[in-house]
Interface confidence: low
Amino acid sequence: QPPPPPPDATCHQVRSFFQRLQPGLKWVPETPVPGSDLQVCLPKGPTCCSRKMEEKYQLTARLNMEQLLQSASMELKFLIIQNAAVFQEAFEIVVRHAKNYTNAMFKNNYPSLTPQAFEFVGEFFTDVSLYILGSDINVDDMVNELFDSLFPVIYTQLMNPGLPDSALDINECLRGARRDLKVFGNFPKLIMTQVSKSLQVTRIFLQALNLGIEVINTTDHLKFSKDCGRMLTRMWYCSYCQGLMMVKPCGGYCNVVMQGCMAGVVEIDKYWREYILSLEELVNGMYRIYDMENVLLGLFSTIHDSIQYVQKNAGKLTTTIGKLCAHSQQRQYR
Amino acid sequence: SAYYPEDLFIDKKVLKVAHVEHEETLSSRRRELIQKLKSFISFYSALPGYICSHSPVAENDTLCWNGQELVERYSQKAARNGMKNQFNLHELKMKGPEPVVSQIIDKLKHINQLLRTMSVPKGRVLDKNLDEEGFESGDCGDDEDECIGGSGDGMMKVKNQLRFLAELAYDLDVDDVPGNNQQATPKDNEISTFHNLGNVH
């Protein structure tokens, strides 16, 4: 085993090296000293380090460690941040397209419904967007509100166009009749099921991505303990005290130190693995009614079918509603 | 806008074309993300090794520093001696993670539970019977991915899955779309490509 080289007799080399870290030379001894006050770089003989230098080394070591950690996670952080932004944007666009398709369906097939239908469709899809972004909205309520709002217009414009415009009184009755008589058949229920399933999955997918960013940010900005700082200092900088400027830490030693410093962070590993695998499982299931793109872009068609269903049963419905909402109508005609 | 993989988005022609092949769908985009994330599955357990390999460590040198002295790289002392006189490593591990790490672990546990709850069991498909009067939605059942709607008079036909999506219209080629006269704000039809990562890396 070769003996360690003698310390730099004048500490000149150590001084010029330390000056890069800390401009101002007063902390570096002129010549090697006993170093009995040192707490980390415990000397075997004379040393070119002082207590103040040790403190600076500890601070630098912890900063180095933080930067290494940030650089380790940069690619992963970029990946998740960018995808979160991309998917959020993409989902907004799907919603916008779905709204446009639905409006186009009304314009092409039921022009007489358009002004009001556009308004109700707009409100519905605004709620869809808000829900995806985490708003506390109930999907069933959204769908019910859409059909509740649409039915009075369908009734007064398509099924019973003779009614006067001031049908405010009858509107409430029609909204109630819509549910009681299941005027749209099972279409609202179908839409509820499809929309709620697909939006729930979409929402949690975005939540998961945002949490991914939070996890990386948390570990990215960890402040390492004093104990860790001492270990790192001993590994990276204590050799300088002996004038060994160019020597590097042993590989096995580095691994032991890093495992000590990162014991807490490594505890995330189990849950991080589970996070990626669970996210994969979710993504694998995002198809058909669990795929908001598929569901929302097909919504115009289902709504169209639901209106056709009403029209198909118009005769029976008009009679029933005529009786059911008679009082409202009488009041209205008076 | 920047940071957007331009290749993710295709132009508005998709709505006019019956057969659009090969373009990227949202679901393929999701799968691609998962594949990339899976390459980071050991991220946290590999961190100590990663940091050692990215900080100065003796690789080709005969001698290395073990925290106390210069030793031969392959000697027993290379890993062991430097740990003498240090505080107990075991103690450091026993302290447990910092509060912020514990908090984030709790959040991960919670989202993992949610993700598992939400994951779709294989083969589960929505019931087909839509109402008690035996209504049938044309030829389109839930099992038919290609069909997203009937076509009443003047109904537009849409290829299932916008394959995807001009409208993040940050497609650089938006100017090249024949007959693309849709009004758009500058934000909508220009992309700052500086941070464009193609397939996000």
Partner: antibody, heavy 107, light 108 residues
Framework: QVQLVQSGAEVKKPGASVKVSCKAS????????ISWVRQAPGQRLEWMGW????????KYSQKFQGRVTITRDTSASTAYMELSSLRSEDTAVYYC?????WGQGTL | EIVLTQSPLSLPVTPGEPASISCRSS???????????LDWYLQKPGQSPQILIY???HRASGVPDRFSGSASGTDFTLKISRVEAEDVGVYYC?????????FGGGTK
């Protein structure tokens, strides 16, 4: 480690053309877009244009439209910027850049 | 095109002191996804620019945490909590919302 290495300095006469190369390494070349940015003495940085290294799509600044051509050779992981009809005011340092990384510049 | 106005033109600072650089945009750089598409770069003497902050407030890898970015409407600020000698150079802001990409005039 990601690196963008540019070709060396050039001296050209007015009216001539110049072609600067930018060799990428340390990442998948086709995964990044590459921008070209120039900096004339004492002037602010000026974006000239961009190429999608994956599919070759380009976008140019209006100011340079018609004079600048950006191309890439995926097999060589290299992007090129050609500027024609040179004028004295084109004297500048020309940089290629990806997300975070910049070339060393070409005068 | 979007115009970015940086101030001050020059900022003499003593090491250890804080510093703040402002960048005002002629229009909002806030995307509908909630991110501000503004980046900060530092160009040290004789070097290429290097990224400090992206998407308004995200610190790039290896950038010391004394650097931070913030936004208020169309006003963006780069702050250095404690300036060090190595921070000397010209700082540029750059908008990445739409082409042409544009840069601020720089703060020395």
């Amino acid at each position: 480690q990601v690196q963008l290495v540019q070709s060396g300095a050039e001296v050209k006469k007015p009216g001539a053309s110049v072609k600067v190369s930018c060799k990428a390494s340390g990442y998948t070349f086709t995964s990044y877009g590459i921008s070209w940015v120039r900096q004339a003495p004492g002037q602010r940085l000026e974006w000239m244009g961009w190429i999608n290294a994956g599919n070759g799509n380009t976008k140019y600044s209006q100011k340079f439209q018609g004079r600048v051509t950006i191309t890439r050779d995926t097999s060589a992981s290299t992007a090129y910027m050609e500027l024609s009809s040179l004028r004295s005011e084109d004297t500048a340092v020309y940089y290629c850049a990806t997300v975070v990384y910049w070339g060393q510049g070409t005068l | 095109e979007i115009v970015l106005t940086q101030s001050p033109l020059s900022l003499p600072v003593t090491p250890g002191e804080p510093a703040s650089i402002s960048c005002r945009s002629s229009q909002s750089l806030l995307h509908s996804n909630g991110y501000n598409y503004l980046d900060w770069y530092l160009q040290k003497p004789g070097q290429s620019p290097q990224i400090l902050i992206y998407l308004g407030s995200h610190r790039a890898s290896g950038v010391p945490d004394r650097f931070s970015g913030s936004a208020s409407g169309t006003d963006f600020t780069l702050k250095i909590s404690r300036v060090e000698a190595e921070d000397v150079g010209v700082y540029y802001c750059m908008q990445a919302l739409q082409t042409p990409l544009t840069f601020g005039g720089g703060t020395k």
